[in-house]
Structure formats: C-alpha cells, structure tokens
C-alpha cells in the first residue's frame, strides 16, 4: 500500500495473508470459516499446496497470539481466469481447518450478486501487507489507504482499452500517489463494509495516477463464489460452518 497508514491492530479482522516459504506473497479476505478469497494470478506459477494462510495478523513477522495459520486444502481459480489479460482474476482458497471467529478474525461481507459497483467518486479503503514504495519496502504492519472509485470507461481509456466490465478501478482523487502495490494482490477493496473489489493489477509504478489501480469486481462473481462453497463440504468439520451474507 502506498500513500496510506498503518491500521489499528486487528481492526480489519477479515484480512488474510497468503505466504510461500515464510514470505508474505498475496493478500486475501475471509468470507466463510473455511474459505478465503484471493487473486487467481497469485497462483499462476505457485503450487497452492505449498502456501499458508494466516488470519488474525497485524505484524506478520511477530508471533501474535491472535494469529491462526492454515494450509491450503484446495485452491479454486475462476474457470475463465485469463493470465494474459487478468480477466476473472479471482480464486477461492479452502482452508485445511475451520477459522475460529473472534475479535481478530471475522468475516467480510460480499456485495449482493450482480450488484452495481459503487458510483464513481465513492470513498473506499484497500488494505494489505504489500510494499509501501516502489523500493519494495515492507510495511511495519497491516496498511490501508483511502481511494475513490473511478469511472470504468475513464479507467479503460487510461489502460489503453485493456479492461473489461467485470473490473473496477480506483484513484487517489488528487494527483498524489495512493493505492496498492506488489504483494497487496488478492486483498479487498472495502466500500460500505462490503468487499466490492479484489486487488488485481496496477501500472509501472504503485499509485501512479496515469494507470489507475484495477480490481476484480466482486459482485460479478458472488454467484460463482457461493456455488463453489456450497459444492464443497468442509473437510473434517464436525460443527456448523459460518459464512458472511
């Protein structure tokens, strides 16, 4: 996250960190006690079974008692994900156990299925443990920045016609650099307490107003998300599982 600030610890309890070989790699968010939403491109060249999902974290390198760590039992990328264009860049991660909900681990609500994205100019927040500058500086803890929804046609023009209707864009609202950066991928864009966007890609430089940040528009995939969750029973789960609605 560039141009943002460190959040109050555990104030974004839905945030998930996806790590490989002990290093944070992508973000995600908890929507069900067994399921985390992330970006499909995070797993294009990575074996999901080698990854770990950490919930309840603030400073990833600190051994916080609130942290819950899971391996990935299954990773379900959207069947129409296109790496060449990053269309349909969304993935569901099934945890190998059930998240225990509490003050530091909570679910994030999804938008209603096929809901219109927030209007241009709407203020939203994006969070993550990605770099805080183009120098690939790691953050001290979970970071967040306020951004504004940008009209998709304006954004598509900035992106030389590469976008599709199931994407969403944000900008800083001024000429300052504010937005996401490498390793924020998969994290949520939260507008009105719902995950309307999922971090997908940005331009040559983090937060560059010339190439606005691009997200997967979550509302376009809500039906698919719950179809996948419903189709898969929680392995080893004896209690009832909880989902955000």
């Amino acid at each position: 996250i560039v141009g943002g600030h460190e959040v109050t610890p555990h104030s974004r309890p839905y945030m998930a960190s996806v790590s490989f070989e002990g290093h944070h790699y992508c973000g995600g968010f908890l929507i069900h006690t067994h399921w985390v939403v992330s970006a499909a491109h995070c797993f294009s060249d990575r074996d999901p079974s080698m990854g770990l999902v950490v919930l309840g974290a603030h400073a990833l390198l600190a051994p916080e008692p609130t942290q819950q760590t899971f391996s990935i039992a299954a990773a379900v990328s959207h069947p129409d994900f296109q790496p060449a264009t990053q269309a349909n860049d969304i993935c569901l991660l099934r945890l190998n156990g059930s998240a225990v909900l509490g003050p530091a681990v909570r679910l994030l609500r999804l938008p209603r299925r096929n809901a219109k994205p927030p209007a241009a100019g709407t203020r939203c927040h994006v969070s993550g443990w990605g770099f805080v500058s183009d120098f690939e500086e790691p953050p001290p803890g979970l970071m967040e920045v306020e951004v504004r929804i940008l009209d998709l046609s304006v954004c598509n023009s900035s992106w030389q016609g590469q976008l599709n209707p199931a994407m969403l864009c944000t900008h800083s609202g001024d000429r300052r650099r504010r937005g996401f950066c490498s390793a924020d991928s998969g994290g949520p864009l939260v507008c009105g307490r719902r995950a309307h966007g999922l971090v997908s890609f940005s331009g040559l430089w983090c937060g560059d107003p010339k190439t606005p940040d691009v997200y997967t528009q979550v509302s376009a995939f809500v039906t698919w998300i719950w179809d996948v969750v419903r189709a898969s029973s929680s392995p080893g789960s004896t209690g009832r599982s909880v989902r955000a609605v």
Epitope: H41, D89, F131, S133, F135, S182, L204, W205, D208
Partner: antibody, heavy 119, light 107 residues
Framework: EVQLVESGGGLVQPGGSLRLSCAAS????????IHWVRQAPGKGLEWVAW????????YYADSVKGRFTISADTSKNTAYLQMNSLRAEDTAVYYC????????????WGQGTLVTVSS | DIQMTQSPSSLSASVGDRVTITCRAS??????VAWYQQKPGKAPKLLIY???FLYSGVPSRFSGSGSGTDFTLTISSLQPEDFATYYC?????????FGQGTKVEIK
C-alpha cells in the same frame, strides 16, 4: 549472472512484421517487469512497452500502440515484441531491459537487436 | 507525457575534470530520476536511480542530486573510461521518458 539476449531483428519492408525475442537468465522472470526500449540511429532512447511480472498487463508508448504487442512466456523466461505495420520511423536498435525494484530504473539491458524498415 | 531536457547536449572535458550534467523535468517527478551511461554500439548502463542512489558496482566518483524538476549528475574526477553519452530518465509518471542525451567528449 543476469543476462538478457535479444534476437529476431532484421530488414523488413514498410507494412511488414517482425517478432523480437528477449531470453532472460539469472533471475526470476516472474519477479520483474520487462521493458522494450529503442534507439534510432544516432538518436536518443525511447521507451516502447512494458509487461508486468505476471505477464497479465501491459502498457505501450503512443507511437506503437495498436501496432506492437508485448508478451511473455514465463516457462521459457522469454519476452516477445510482435511488431506489425512497421514504418520507416520504427528503424532502431531494440533493447529489452529488466526493472530494478518496482520499475524505478532499468538495471540490466540486452545487447540490442537492429530492426531496419526500408523498401 | 513528461519531457526531460538535458543540458548541455555535449561538452568537452579533460581527464580529472569535474563534470556536471543537468536534467529538467517538465513537471514534478519527486526523486524518481535515473541516470545512464552509454558508449557507442553498447547498451546503456545504470549509474544512479531515484535521483541520488548509486547503483551497485558504479564508481563513487558518480553522484546524483535533485528533486522536483531539477536534477544533476556529477562526475567528480573524469576518467578516460567516462567519455560517453549520458541520459536521464524519469520514473514517476507513465510513460517513462528519457532526456535527449549529453555527449561527454575529450578536450
């Protein structure tokens, strides 16, 4: 040792096509953006195109937009520049370059490949 | 697009001289400027990034400074191998743009 090796240059008629390749070694291709930069004979440097580390997004200079396409095959550690509808003003040495950090500079460059557009 | 204007376009200097090349951006680019050295028939080599950071392996006689719109590359004591063309480049706003180059020749 980091290496970038371009190939595919040559003489082509106006309106023709060429595909340049940039074979990378010594670094993780999927961890770094790749750029093409060109230099017309006796002139300065001009940035042409970029492809992100994931290969999922691209950006082009206005002068080549709609005619050139940058792509990458991460399994082969190779980037490509497909050049269509070539013009005399596209004549240049084409370099591929690797990003330092998040594109703060170009830290490694290939040796360049000459593209000549002439009838 | 941001224009990068270098001056002078060429200069003559002797070994041991202190050489200064300037680069002016058409709008604020913060400290996102890199400097490169290029010799005839060769690819450019990175010297300085983010206005003042010396790239690994580059001799300490090279230094960079500036922020906003005005930037400087200084060679404190010119060596025979430094005769080349030098380019600045902004890395702040898409697309990246280069200066037109400054050719450093032997006096």
């Amino acid at each position: 040792e980091v290496q970038l090796v371009e190939s595919g240059g040559g003489l082509v008629q106006p309106g023709g096509s060429l595909r340049l390749s940039c074979a990378a070694s010594g670094f993780t291709f999927s961890g770094s953006g790749i750029h093409w930069v060109r230099q017309a004979p006796g002139k300065g440097l001009e940035w042409v195109a970029w492809i992100s580390p994931t290969g999922g997004n691209t950006y082009y200079a206005d002068s080549v937009k709609g005619r050139f396409t940058i792509s990458a095959d991460t399994s082969k550690n190779t980037a490509y520049l497909q050049m269509n509808s070539l013009r005399a003003e596209d004549t240049a040495v084409y370099y591929c370059a690797k990003s330092l950090f998040h594109n703060v500079a170009f830290d490694y460059w290939g040796q360049g490949t000459l593209v000549t557009v002439s009838s | 697009d941001i224009q990068m204007t270098q001056s002078p376009s060429s200069l003559s200097a002797s070994v041991g001289d202190r050489v200064t090349i300037t680069c002016r951006a058409s709008q604020d680019v913060s400290t996102a400027v890199a400097w490169y050295q290029q010799k005839p028939g060769k690819a450019p080599k990175l010297l300085i990034y983010s206005a003042s950071f010396l790239y690994s392996g580059v001799p300490s006689r090279f230094s960079g400074s500036g922020s906003g719109t005005d930037f400087t590359l200084t060679i404190s004591s010119l060596q025979p191998e430094d005769f080349a063309t030098y380019y600045c480049q902004q890395a702040n706003s898409t697309p990246p743009t280069f200066g037109q180059g400054t050719k450093v020749e032997i006096k």
